[in-house]
């Protein structure tokens, strides 16, 4: 930028230094040089001399015209060619910007992640504006009528300490930039209805060596919420389609879920929970990969036409023994957790 340029004249922009992308723009340069009657006035955009659509209005002033200016940012400056001077003389410069007014923010969502101490609100900003755009989040108590406002760029975290006076709120977002202002639809929020339970984690899995082997998945959460509804999705790593099973969970103890799965296959498991009867889900947990045991030679495996699952509190010890005549067949492969950062949202897919 050129905030501290010393001008020997003036430069101005019509319709203004920030304007709607695609508009026709006129930029004027007026010299006020001492001891110079300029032969020519020149315009530069981002350091490159412009050749076309320049009009000399009078002895001191020239204009350059751009049809449908569509660059988000440009640095313009103008110079004078003074008789007897080897170099051009700087007159003035300006940063110009083009962009769009904001769209109305959409899909406003507010949640409280358990133990976070914050209400987190997110929204879709719409199409890019290309210029500085701020979002004002309005939080109005439906009980006291008091309104709080928070400035944000893309989301906001509001301390629940500042939401002590009430449980019911009206929330909306105002998008503001130099070219316009739009409001989102209003969201009715009850603080007790937007809590997302503390993250659910699959801690381990094991496959038994029963006549019909079963896989037990162990999962837990530090939530203090009593009634929690969960989904566990699972698939082989080669499959595109998830199977989903539903559970009512009580996290005062580690959850155990039994699955009857195909042998000698690598499975991916993920879990997510919500407070029973509420709307907001946790994001899916990190993918947990487990390899089921190979078949024994004695058993003719008949895969279930539809794998079924149920929960049990029965304890099953992890298989470590190996058959003496087929040592490699019963060996357990240890489960591993991918510790990457899966995509956010509830539609995270694993290859």
């Amino acid at each position: 930028g050129i905030t501290s340029i010393n001008c020997s004249g003036d430069m101005w922009v019509e319709p203004g230094e920030i304007f709607q992308m695609g508009m026709n723009v006129s930029i004027y340069c007026q010299e006020a040089l001492k001891h110079c009657r300029p032969r020519n006035l020149y315009f530069y955009k981002n350091g490159f001399k412009e050749e076309f659509d320049i009009t000399r209005i009078n002895r001191t002033t020239a204009r350059i015209w751009y049809k449908g200016f569509s660059e988000p940012h440009a640095y313009m400056h103008c110079t004078a060619e003074c008789p007897g001077h080897f170099q051009e003389t700087l007159i003035c410069g300006k940063d110009i910007s083009s962009g769009h007014p904001p769209d109305a923010p959409s899909n406003l969502t507010c949640v409280i992640y358990e133990y976070s101490g914050n209400m987190t609100c997110t929204w879709n900003t719409g199409k890019p504006t290309y210029i500085d755009t701020k979002y004002i989040v309005h939080v109005k108590s439906l009980e006291t009528e008091e309104e709080q406002q928070y400035l944000a760029s893309s989301y906001v975290k509001i301390s629940t300490d500042s939401l002590q006076g009430s449980r019911k709120y009206l929330v909306w977002v105002q998008a503001v930039n130099s070219l316009g202002m739009e409001n989102s639809q209003q969201l009715h929020v009850h603080l007790d209805d937007i809590v997302i339970p503390s993250a659910s984690i699959i801690s381990r899995a094991e496959t038994t060596n029963d006549t019909v082997p079963k896989t037990i998945v162990y999962w837990k959460s530090k939530t203090m919420i009593e009634k929690v509804f969960c989904e566990m999705r699972y698939k082989t790593t080669t499959n595109q389609t998830w199977s989903v099973k539903e559970f009512d969970a009580n996290f005062t103890y580690v959850q155990q879920s039994e699955f009857y799965l195909e042998p000698d296959s690598k499975y991916v498991f993920q879990v997510r929970c919500q407070e029973t009867g509420k709307r907001n889900w946790q994001p899916w947990s990190s993918p947990f990969v487990h390899q089921t045991s190979q078949e024994t030679g004695k058993r003719n495996w008949q895969p279930w036409s539809s794998p079924f699952v149920h929960q049990t509190s029965q304890t099953v010890s992890q298989v470590t023994a190996k058959s003496s005549h087929e040592p490699q067949k019963m060996e357990m492969l240890s489960a591993t957790i991918f510790r990457g950062h899966p995509a956010s949202g509830n539609h995270q897919d694993i290859g």
Partner: nanobody, 116 residues
Framework: QVQLQESGGGLVQPGGSLRLSCAAS????????MRWVRQAPGKGLEWVSG???????IYADSVKGRFTISRDNAKNTLYLQLNSLKTEDTAMYYC??????????GSQGTQVTVSS
């Protein structure tokens, strides 16, 4: 009831600086977003700048890079630092609740005059 008292205005030459203050009472200042608006002679009210309770700020294009809004929650006071003043900054300056908008709630204001 809500009370806002502006001060710090005066006569200053172009290029000069001033610091405006707004003393607040009658509401929970630390939880309340605030703004400055101004009214030039013969013109309508113009929003200048806003700040939320956490200190995030927003400015009108006409003052960006020259004015700085800030707050001291311990003193229940809002500030506006005016630098590189221009003649077109001459106006009555008012503080108000809320981060954005070209209205104010009837406080007395403080006069800023920029003239050589």
């Amino acid at each position: 009831q809500v009370q806002l008292q502006e001060s710090g205005g005066g006569l200053v030459q172009p290029g000069g600086s001033l610091r405006l203050s707004c003393a607040a009472s009658g509401f929970t200042f630390r939880l309340t977003a605030m703004r400055w608006v101004r009214q030039a002679p013969g013109k309508g009210l113009e929003w200048v700048s806003g700040i939320d309770s956490r200190g995030s700020t927003i400015y009108a294009d006409s003052v960006k890079g020259r004015f700085t809004i800030s707050r001291d929650n311990a003193k229940n006071t809002l500030y506006l630092q005016l630098n590189s003043l221009k003649t077109e900054d001459t106006a009555m300056y008012y503080c108000a609740q809320g981060v954005y908008g070209d209205t104010y709630s009837g406080s007395q204001g403080t006069q800023v005059t920029v003239s050589s």
